[in-house]
């Protein structure tokens, strides 16, 4: 299994080499 998984599902996806920990990999961007 991977050594590091911060965001599950869409939060773990990377898009255009940008880490998606803030929701960039999700269809809807939701910040706190």
């Amino acid at each position: 299994s991977p050594k590091m998984v911060q965001g599950s599902g869409c939060f773990g996806r990377k898009m255009d080499r940008i880490s998606s920990s803030s929701g960039l990999g999700c269809k809807v961007l939701r910040r706190h």
Epitope: G7, S8, G9, S21, K27
Partner: antibody
Framework: QIQLVQSGPELRKPGETVKISCKGS????????INWVKQTPRKDLKWMGW????????IYADDFKGRFAFSLETSANTAYLQINNLNNGDMGTYFC??????????WGQGTSVTVSS | DNVLTQSPPSLAVSLGQRATISCKAS??????????LNWYQQKPGQPPKFLIY???NLESGIPARFSGSGSGTDFNLNIHPVEEEDAATYYC?????????FGSGTKLEIK
């Protein structure tokens, strides 16, 4: 073995605050995000959001913005959920759960929150 | 939000027979060839247990009598042959979109 151990049941009055802890063991705590899930008295499961244990950044679902706060004490391998200004709708069982690439793989035992005047 | 509708709400299956639980999403949970659909088992007084991820992948330690299938919006969890210890409530969950959502659960009784 991998474990998430949560603090015990809580009884609070309306308007009060509760802080639930979730201690991870058996893995590198800062390598995996922690999600929070509420189970209502009707047994519905609601994802509240998650916190990045490496950066400390919290992400909240819309229904849990405002009175809810995720935090960390990484030196103690512990995540926290704080709920302010409690009301009857906050009653239920709260679970911390570890991020998996697709889902939520390890779960704490749950912390029951009762709100009663 | 992506609404997950599980059916039936409850079912009773004889020991050794097949249990099939359906989960239908209001929007596709597929992305880049993966289905972001997971299944959990919950017994009374316990937390949910991770069973199946990405629609059809068995989590480590889960018996092979559990299997998952489907893509897009329609998914199934199959248990065959059903054993006594499988009596529980089963939930599907999508992680393709924020907020993650769960189905309302299917309670499985063993006859």
């Amino acid at each position: 073995q991998i474990q998430l151990v949560q603090s015990g049941p809580e009884l609070r009055k309306p308007g009060e605050t509760v802080k639930i802890s979730c201690k991870g063991s058996g893995y590198t705590f800062t390598h995996y995000g922690i999600n929070w899930v509420k189970q209502t008295p009707r047994k519905d499961l609601k994802w509240m959001g998650w916190i990045n244990t490496h950066t400390g950044e919290p992400i909240y679902a819309d229904d849990f913005k405002g009175r809810f706060a995720f935090s960390l004490e990484t030196s103690a391998n512990t995540a926290y959920l704080q709920i302010n200004n409690l009301n009857n709708g906050d009653m239920g069982t709260y679970f911390c759960t570890r991020s998996h690439r697709f889902g939520l793989d390890y779960w704490g035992q749950g912390t029951s929150v009762t709100v009663s005047s | 939000d992506n609404v997950l509708t599980q059916s039936p709400p409850s079912l009773a299956v004889s020991l050794g027979q097949r249990a099939t639980i359906s989960c239908k999403a209001s929007q596709s949970v597929d992305y880049n060839g993966d289905s972001y659909l997971n299944w959990y088992q919950q017994k009374p007084g316990q937390p949910p247990k991770f069973l199946i991820y990405a629609a059809s992948n068995l989590e480590s330690g889960i018996p092979a009598r559990f299997s998952g299938s489907g893509s897009g919006t329609d998914f199934n969890l199959n248990i065959h042959p059903v054993e006594e210890e499988d009596a529980a409530t089963y939930y599907c969950q999508q992680s393709n979109e924020d907020p993650f959502t769960f189905g309302s659960g299917t309670k499985l009784e063993i006859k």
